[in-house]
């Protein structure tokens, strides 16, 4: 058993049928010595008396808010949560496996640049009685500071019969140098509590591996005289690290017909312009990627050929 | 990534082309190592990230772009003298650079070259003959060093009398390649910045 926060405790249980569970001793936070009784949640049934209460915690029915009283007055509370260990592996019931980029990916994180700011998000089908708390650091043995905000509900989607909820959090490394070569990964730890169930999820990454630039901005077409060709031009996104000559991007320019089956013409360039043939009803899209370290491509920025 | 490669024109900053070749070569070598050594811990998540140049060179600090010198987090151990030698310094354009920058890059390359050659000698003794260093990568390191044209004492190749542990050697190869790829990215950024300055 360990303390998650003041008066909230997590009991770790080896979770299998007929498991013996864990013996837990609760102590009433009071100078009083006698006349103390204990109850669980809203029940008035007295579970025991005395300054300490010993309970055998086996199932969720044994978890909850234990309260010690004296003469009708509440003295203190202890909330017990359960953390299930199933065959040596901590349960992952609360969050959905996003399966990207690999199985057992519960937290996904992205950064728009090398400033040390990043966003993580996760999915759940649970809509109520759910709380998250996020901590982060650079490295784990001698951790350096990363400050995270509060997790917020950022999207709701309908997936078949189920509703899916996306939560996200923004974090910022306290002293980040964009040009630094990372040798210790960022660690992100999310505590999730659903009713009386506690779970924790972690992700470990280098900022360089989660970079995903914003799409190029100011995408424009300039028709070339007496030709079906157009000059496409764009600019680096505002959110990308500067100077751009040091943090350079490379670009992919795509001409896509109206039908998805039509052949796509693609050109790769390090410049911020390209000359392409603009077909009728086609659209031109441009996306960006770090020129020197192949992390994710940005989303496409698009304009119609017409 | 198969991108069209532009051939640098002669007036271009002389080292840019070599640094691009270096990054391509080390990335290819790392990919080959990860495929060949699939049963070894060779991914970024599995290896310890060690920098053999740590406390010996200060490439990131010495080659920091001017715009980032205002960022206190980037100024841990920044030196402040200016570069005056080295053939990559094609013009006064690079006068903003600190004395350490290109010589620091040269020292990095020299250290990695020695490590890779020593490692290759060990790998050639492996009866499994599972993996060797790409000669193209070694050649590209050499070309960039020649283009940098710094005079420095030659570091003798380390020779080891004891029987090599091939498992450990292959893991060390992965660690070296990951670190060298990160340094090659920094070198490419620096060369690109110098070229634009």
């Amino acid at each position: 058993i360990w303390e998650l926060k003041k008066d909230v405790y997590v009991v770790e249980l080896d979770w299998y049928p007929d498991a013996p569970g864990e013996m837990v001793v609760l102590t009433c936070d009071t100078p009083e010595e006698d006349g103390i009784t204990w109850t669980l949640d809203q029940s008035s049934e007295v579970l025991g008396s005395g300054k300490t209460l010993t309970i055998q915690v086996k199932e969720f029915g044994d978890a909850g808010q234990y309260t010690c009283h004296k003469g009708g007055e509440v003295l203190s509370h202890s909330l017990l949560l359960l953390h299930k260990k199933e065959d040596g592996i901590w349960s992952t019931d609360i969050l959905k496996d996003q399966k990207e980029p690999k199985n057992k990916t519960f937290l996904r994180c992205e950064a728009k640049n090398y400033s040390g700011r990043f966003t993580c998000w996760w999915l759940t089908t649970i809509s109520t009685d759910l709380t998250f708390s996020v901590k982060s650091s650079r490295g784990s043995s001698d951790p350096q500071g990363v400050t995270c905000g509060a997790a917020t509900l950022s999207a709701e989607r309908v997936r078949g019969d189920n509703k899916e909820y996306e939560y996200s959090v923004e974090c910022q490394e306290d002293s980040a140098c964009p040009a630094a070569e990372e040798s210790l990964p960022i660690e992100v730890m999310v505590d999730a509590v659903h009713k009386l169930k506690y779970e924790n999820y972690t992700s470990s990454f280098f900022i360089r591996d989660i970079i995903k630039p914003d799409p190029p901005k100011n995408l424009q077409l300039k028709p070339l005289k007496n030709s079906r060709q157009v000059e496409v031009s764009w600019e680096y996104p505002d959110t990308w690290s500067t100077p751009h000559s040091y943090f350079s991007l490379t670009f992919c320019v795509q001409v896509q017909g109206k039908s998805k089956r039509e052949k796509k013409d693609r050109v790769f360039t390090d410049k911020t312009s390209a000359t392409v043939i603009c077909r009728k009803n086609a659209s031109i899209s441009v996306r960006a990627q770090d020129r020197y370290y192949s992390s994710s491509w940005s989303e496409w920025a698009s304009v119609p050929c017409s | 990534r198969n991108l069209p490669v532009a051939t640098p024109d002669p007036g271009m900053f002389p080292c840019l082309h070599h640094s691009q070749n270096l990054l391509r070569a080390v990335s290819n070598m790392l990919q080959k190592a990860r495929q060949t050594l699939e049963f070894y811990p060779c991914t970024s998540e599995e290896i310890d990230h060690e920098d053999i140049t740590k406390d010996k060179t200060s490439t990131v600090e010495a080659c920091l772009p001017l715009e980032l010198t205002k960022n206190e987090s980037c100024l841990n151990s920044r030196e402040t003298s200016f570069i005056t030698n080295g053939s990559c310094l094609a013009s006064r354009k690079t006068s903003f650079m600190m004395a350490l920058c290109l010589s620091s890059i040269y020292e990095d390359l020299k250290m990695y070259q020695v490590e890779f050659k020593t490692m290759n000698a060990k790998l050639l003794m492996d009866p499994k003959r599972q993996i060797f260093l790409d000669q193209n990568m070694l050649a590209v390191i050499d070309e960039l060093m020649q283009a940098l044209n710094f005079n420095s004492e030659t570091v003798p190749q380390k020779s080891s009398l004891e029987e090599p542990d091939f498992y450990k050697t292959k893991i060390k190869l992965c660690i070296l390649l990951h670190a060298f790829r990160i340094r090659a990215v920094t070198i490419d950024r620096v060369m690109s910045y110098l070229n634009a300055s």
Epitope: D14, W15, A19, E86, G88, D93, K104 | -
Partner: antibody, heavy 115, light 112 residues
Framework: QVQLVQSGGGVVQPGRSLRLSCAAS????????MHWVRQAPGKGLEWVAF????????YYADSVKGRFTISRDNSKNTLYLQMKSLRAEDTAVYYC????????WGQGTMVTVSS | SYVLTQPPSVSGTPGQRVTISCSGG????????VKWYQQLPGTAPKLLIY???QRPSGVPDRFSGSKSGTSASLAITGVQAEDEADYYC????????????FGTGTKVTVLG
């Protein structure tokens, strides 16, 4: 004490269907994940499928994906395996089993797929 | 397809020490716990070892398990005639959990 009693096995022709049941008692069935495991005659153990305690997630071996469906009725304390498009290679003893560091197995039920 | 490899058979005379190996990889045994089962003819598997080296109550202490790196082993010290059975190791793969990964199985024969 924990008990898992299986039923539903038998002889079936290729291409036909069969449903296996596993009745649980002696524990809070709705709190635990459950597996199906099979063993072809003279062969080793092969995992078939898993279902979460609340039925929210199901996992299948590639060899049965799209043909077999694992389900549970927590009100009846029963686990099911619906098997469709049966093949000769599905012939095996099928076991249900609890998920956890200490597990409990059903007695097994024989499924024979033969024309 | 079995990812955990066991020897097809091992044998020993009563009182001898018999060991069965179970070889896997970094993503299964290297990252997860190992269990061992004993299966007597015509019966369901019985749990002998869980959590690499833990014995459930009721399992004789002549059975012991261990794990090192990407391999695990089961030892029977002082093998007895009633130990003649098939033995299976089981683990998980970190990418496919909760799918159970079973070993290929080992037939233990007690000679004499």
């Amino acid at each position: 004490q924990v008990q898992l009693v299986q039923s539903g096995g038998g002889v079936v022709q290729p291409g036909r269907s069969l449903r296996l049941s596993c009745a649980a008692s002696g524990f809070t069935f709705s709190s635990y994940g459950m597996h199906w495991v099979r063993q072809a005659p003279g062969k080793g153990l092969e995992w078939v499928a898993f279902i979460r305690y609340d039925g929210s997630n199901k996992y299948y071996a590639d060899s049965v994906k799209g043909r077999f469906t694992i389900s549970r009725d927590n009100s009846k304390n029963t686990l099911y395996l619906q098997m469709k498009s049966l093949r000769a290679e599905d012939t095996a003893v099928y076991y249900c089993k609890t998920h956890g560091s200490h597990d409990n197995w059903g007695q097994g039920t024989m499924v024979t797929v033969s024309s | 397809s079995y990812v955990l490899t066991q020897p097809p058979s091992v044998s020993g005379t009563p009182g001898q020490r018999v060991t069965i190996s179970c070889s896997g990889g970094r993503s299964n045994i290297g990252s997860n716990n190992v269990k061992w089962y004993q299966q007597l003819p015509g019966t369901a598997p019985k749990l002998l070892i869980y959590g690499n080296d833990q014995r459930p109550s009721g399992v004789p202490d002549r059975f012991s398990g261990s794990k090192s790196g990407t391999s695990a082993s089961l030892a029977i010290t002082g093998v007895q005639a009633e130990d003649e059975a098939d033995y299976y190791c089981q683990s998980y793969d970190r990418g496919t959990h909760p799918a159970l990964l079973f070993g290929t199985g080992t037939k233990v024969t007690v000679l004499g």
